[in-house]
Interface confidence: low
């Protein structure tokens, strides 16, 4: 389905609006450091441009493709090598290598200050003064902080966004509105961030094979009715649309994920009896809601998976005539019976499988040798069952905060080298696994947690990528995208690790911690513990737990003092003192 | 090691008042921090007092202005004097003690306000 201008055909499919929010996403997760009034400039010359190829197909330049497009017009940008280095070498390259180079440049956590939220009163003037402007700034803000962010979902984002003002700045309490609903999307925002940060390392480390597998896993889970071949032409479609966005393809992504929509409303009854209530909402909506449909009821009369892949005198014929059709049709099989198994699980028993039938099928009795296969799956099985039920129980235990000082201690001890503020950040999120998940009953518990977890220490792979200091987390990161977690929790102290020196302004806290909102006031805490345990790695629970309830009495007893700053002059020192001694 | 008996706890309608003591032993020469945490039940563990060797002291807003904590180091004694008492401050109160946190813990002494 060729088109002679790349670019009229896909600003007529999404419409301009659309078209525009794309551009300006795709040029702010490439150029992170620009101002906002820059990247406006540049969108508007491109729409411009695909105007008149809209009218004329055979203009100059229409028939490019739309990275050279693009990269050309980002080359314009007069600032490039001031502001980002040797990106601007990219700018020498030819195409497809120009736009290699520019993903390589992309830097999940780039040096931007967070985002301050204005009084509600002066976000809505702005909102009302110029609703386009407003909405540009939400689209470029996050994407520029997220450069994997998911396009056109946060294209979704941003409507619910532009709806959340559209409504609460008439209403009585505007804050009271308005609030809640801006907690809701930052916290879904970064969620949604991270789960496309997954997808995307998955295709670029592991390549699609691996993001086929885990698509295979995760449908054939929400749709268990539907047949293989149909669950096999949505993974297709879903691995082409989240190649093309984690390549950049931002416009062709959108486009087909469009196209997926459309089909899975078109065949709903070959694929789910949850798609019907997706299916009447408008474009963007309706996307959102099919990639989040719950599970499809399992059929009644599912067989014993025994007989096709243990006990059938075929297998090996099966499984030399078409490896990856039949290793599919196992992980659907599997996938299907089994919604309370995290994906990751799943695909362990997949290689498990694989592995077995690799060796077996050379064996001088196949059939033999491959019978008890499914008896090797138990110990994959109890492995993260027993982690959930341990964890959830330390969570209910203790509760999120000490859950999160629990996981920093634990990840601290495992991976000194790693930054305080990755440990604190990735660790807080780990922390986060109990809220989310341990209140679901138990069949849900496994899928939510360990596919939860891979999010998050994927996140600390991505950020230990661009400035390596581990050895052990290189080899979780690298070695099997299945096995990362399992990986990390069988780390163990790192007895090669030597001590970091004790430096007293670490622990040097001022009267600002007592103007600090709560969330703040722990990860100043949070911090102060990670190097505690950089400083004294084999300090027991006990030793931690002391310290950090006097550095809270403390900062609790010079925050209500009158002259605070002279209370933390006095009292920090002792408290330093009295650390030290109680960590000797 | 140090040992801690509390003592003082029992009934007590709403308004009034009671003392409980806590008797230290043991090295108690380290002993810089003492406190009172009380639990009722179902809840988690509450911190309620705490004072320093040299006499400095803190409470939560639950009880300020109407709990004071006091310790006479000469007879190794920690006290808590409980004033206009109320249904909600029924619980177990538990001593506890330590050179840099609390990390010794008494048995615990149960406070019934009731009418």
């Known amino acids: 389905d060729t088109h002679k201008s790349e670019v009229a055909h896909r600003f007529k499919d999404l419409g301009e609006e659309h078209f525009k929010g794309l551009v300006l996403v795709a040029f702010s997760q490439y150029l992170q450091q620009c101002p906002f009034e820059e990247h406006v400039k540049l969108v508007n010359e491109v729409t411009e441009f695909a105007k008149t190829c809209v009218a004329d197909e055979s203009a100059e330049n229409c028939d490019k493709s739309l990275h050279t497009l693009f990269g050309d017009k980002l080359c314009t940008v007069a600032t490039l090598r001031e502001t980002y280095g040797e990106m601007a070498d990219c700018c020498a390259k030819q195409e497809p290598e120009r736009n290699e180079c520019f993903l390589q440049h992309k830097d999940d956590n780039p040096n931007l200050p967070p985002l301050v939220r204005p009084e509600v009163d002066v976000m809505c003037t702005a909102f009302h003064d110029n609703e386009a402007t407003f909405l540009k700034k939400y689209l470029y803000e996050v994407a520029r902080r997220h450069p994997y962010f998911y396009a056109p979902e946060l294209l979704f984002f941003a409507a619910r966004y532009k709806a959340a003002f559209a409504e609460c700045c008439q209403a009585a309490d505007k804050a009271a509105c308005l609030l809640p609903k801006l907690d809701e999307l930052r916290d879904e925002g970064k969620a949604s961030s991270a789960k496309q940060r997954l997808k995307c390392a998955s295709l670029q480390k592991f390549g699609d094979r691996a993001f086929k597998a885990w698509a295979v896993a995760r449908l054939s889970q929400k749709f268990p009715k539907a047949e293989f071949a149909e669950v096999s032409k949505l993974v297709t479609d879903l691995t082409k649309v989240h190649t093309e966005c984690c390549h950049g393809d931002l416009l062709e992504c959108a486009d087909d994920r469009a196209d997926l929509a459309k089909y899975m409303c078109e065949n709903q009854d070959s694929i789910s009896s949850k798609l019907k209530e997706c299916c009447d909402k408008p474009l963007l909506e309706k996307s959102h809601c099919l990639a989040e449909v719950e599970n499809d009821e399992m059929p009644a009369d599912l067989p014993s998976l025994a007989a096709d892949y243990v006990e059938s005198k075929d297998v090996c014929k099966n499984y030399a005539e078409a490896k990856d059709v039949f290793l599919g049709m196992f992980l659907y099989e599997y996938a299907r019976r089994h919604p309370d198994y995290s994906v990751m699980l799943l695909l362990r028993l997949a290689k498990a499988y694989e592995a077995t039938l690799e060796k077996c099928c050379a064996a001088a009795d196949p059939h033999e040798c491959y019978a008890k296969v499914f008896d090797e799956f138990q110990p994959l099985v109890e492995e993260p069952q027993n982690l959930v039920k341990q964890n959830c129980e330390l969570f209910e235990q203790l509760g999120e905060y000490k859950f999160q000082n629990a996981l920093l201690v634990r990840y601290t001890k495992k991976v000194p080298q790693v930054s305080t503020p990755t440990l604190v950040e990735v660790s807080r999120n780990l922390g986060k696994v109990g809220a989310k998940c341990c209140k679901l009953p138990e069949a849900k518990r496994m899928p939510c947690a360990e596919d939860y977890l891979s999010v998050v220490l994927n996140r600390l792979c991505v950020l230990h990528e661009k400035t390596p200091v581990s050895e052990k987390v290189t080899k979780c990161c690298t070695e099997s995208l299945v096995n990362r977690r399992p990986c990390f929790s069988a780390l163990e102290l790192d007895e090669a690790y030597v001590p970091k020196a004790f430096n007293a302004e670490t622990f040097t806290f001022h009267a600002d911690m007592c103007t600090l909102s709560e969330k703040e006031k722990q990860v100043k805490k949070q911090t102060a513990l990670v190097e505690l345990v950089k400083h004294k790695p084999k300090a027991t629970k006990e030793q931690l737990k002391g310290v950090m309830d006097n550095f809270a009495a403390f900062v609790e007893k010079c925050c209500k003092a009158d002259d605070k700053e002279a209370c933390f002059a006095e009292e920090g020192p002792k408290f330093v003192a009295a650390s030290q001694a109680a960590l000797a | 090691q140090v040992q801690l008996v509390e003592s003082g706890g029992g009934l007590v309608q709403p308004g009034g008042s009671l003392r409980l003591s806590c008797a230290a032993s043991g090295s108690i020469e380290s002993i810089n921090r003492m406190a009172w945490y009380r639990q009722a039940p179902g809840q988690q563990r509450e911190f309620v007092a705490r004072?320093?060797?040299?006499?400095?002291?803190n409470y939560p807003d639950s009880v300020k202005g109407r709990f004071t904590i006091s310790r006479d180091n000469s007879k190794n004694t920690l006290y808590l004097q409980m004033n206009s008492l109320r249904a909600e401050d029924t619980a177990v109160y538990y001593c506890a003690a330590g050179p840099v946190w609390e990390q010794f813990w008494g048995q615990g002494t149960l406070v019934t306000v009731s009418s």
């Open positions: 004072i320093s060797k040299g006499g400095s002291t």
